[in-house]
Interface confidence: low
Amino acid sequence: QQQTLPKPFIWAEPHFMVPKEKQVTICCQGNYGAVEYQLHFEGSLFAVDRPKPPERINKVQFYIPDMNSRMAGQYSCIYRVGELWSEPSNLLDLVVTEMYDTPTLSVHPGPEVISGEKVTFYCRLDTATSMFLLLKEGRSSHVQRGYGKVQAEFPLGPVTTAHRGTYRCFGSYNNHAWSFPSEPVKLLVTGDIENTSLAPEDPTFPADTWGTYLLTTETGLQKDHALWDHTAQNLLR
């Protein structure tokens, strides 16, 4: 006899990185017929939703209208069908950004390099933080951690055309509170003669909206965001 239901899927729309004072919706998708969903924050019950009619709804949304450091942390959700509860969802790390200061991002030897060259990014922030994060824009973004008193190094090693793209960095005051994003640095990698045609890049945030990425809700990218979030959040743990 089944003792628990399958775990629900949790994600943040439009993104798990939320600028302070902006809004975010935490989505929890369970099963049709679920009569109650519970959202847990840092291990304690945070909110409850009872969908109506339950047989026609398999997803609930918990709206946070005002993101701040109090709301940043680890969320999970569960749901109930009759008296039977589900397994808890994976953990969702909700991060508040645009806290305090703006780091500076630079790249060595420069933003235009040849395939095979060794490239290093430097993220600098003169305030009290020792952890830095480097992100490449795009759906399958890679998030790297670096450590240092005021500056962290991010060696990419010998680059290929796959490293092309726009990079930003953040200072991290704790796992769930990040600085403003740095100004973008666009890395251009030229390849061999036969590889000079630009391969299509990963789907990205609209080019001009990184500063307000919270406001870019693209329904078609929600699942992609969730995959992106999963990649990024593994680095948070």
Partner: antibody, heavy 115, light 107 residues
Framework: QVQLVQSGAEVKKPGASVMVSCKAS????????IHWVRQATGQGLEWMGY????????KYSQRFQGRLTLTKDTSADTAYMELSSLGSEDTAVYYC????????WGQGTLVTVSS | DIQMTQSPSSLSASVGDRVTITCRAS??????LAWYQQKPGKAPKLLIY???RLESGVPSRFSGSGSGTDFTLTISSLQPEDFATYYC?????????FGQGTKVEIK
């Protein structure tokens, strides 16, 4: 810094309506719910309802359903509370407060209902 | 609606005393509880949210604990500026409800 500034004191006759404004500054008005809480002299705090300034959707306490109207003017970053059919028991200080935990409050508006 | 019951309704204490105020919910509210301080003629001020998390700028002599139905606000060493009325409030479900208040007076 975040501030909620309310309109001045009002004196109303029984049966009349009163409107209190709450001007927000120091943050993005549309991203925070505005709640209304009242307090009669020497009494405790009583939640009345809230409005989401982004969507304009409001939720009311059962006790005030039908005579409380919450509205907003996003161009002025201002929320409004209108209470109709006033009685002497509505004499109180009315506060607006921000977001889930009521982390910022207006200074309060005294509404006196007297014939 | 969830009823919040505070005790005591008033207490007298001296500067330096340790003061404890309790709040009980009529049903389980997990840690969805806030504490406020209010001085005469002023708006309430948030002290503690999520039962135990100290609001930014609030002195560390204030602390909160509890989960479920029973909660406590503790002032470890009462200061002159702490004489005020304290309210608990649940934000577990709508409508949010407040305790009736605890007045802390000078002995």
């Amino acid at each position: 810094q975040v501030q909620l500034v309310q309109s001045g004191a009002e004196v109303k006759k029984p049966g009349a309506s009163v409107m209190v404004s709450c001007k927000a500054s120091g943050y993005t008005f549309t991203t925070n719910n505005i709640h209304w809480v009242r307090q009669a002299t020497g009494q405790g705090l009583e939640w009345m309802g809230y409005i989401n300034p982004g969507s304009g959707k409001a939720k009311y306490s059962q006790r005030f359903q039908g005579r409380l109207t919450l509205t907003k003017d996003t161009s002025a970053d201002t929320a409004y509370m209108e209470l109709s059919s006033l009685g002497s028991e509505d004499t109180a200080v009315y506060y607006c407060a921000r977001t889930y935990y009521f982390d910022y409050w207006g200074q309060g508006t005294l509404v006196t209902v007297s014939s | 609606d969830i009823q919040m019951t505070q005790s005591p309704s008033s207490l007298s204490a001296s500067v330096g005393d340790r003061v404890t105020i309790t709040c009980r919910a009529s049903q389980g509210i997990s840690n969805a509880l806030a504490w406020y301080q209010q001085k005469p003629g002023k708006a309430p001020k948030l002290l503690i949210y999520a039962a135990s998390r100290l609001e930014s700028g609030v002195p560390s002599r204030f602390s909160g604990s509890g989960s479920g139905t029973d909660f406590t606000l503790t002032i470890s060493s009462l200061q002159p500026e702490d004489f005020a009325t304290y309210y608990c409030q649940q934000h577990y479900s709508t409508p949010p409800t407040f305790g009736q208040g605890t007045k802390v007076e000078i002995k």
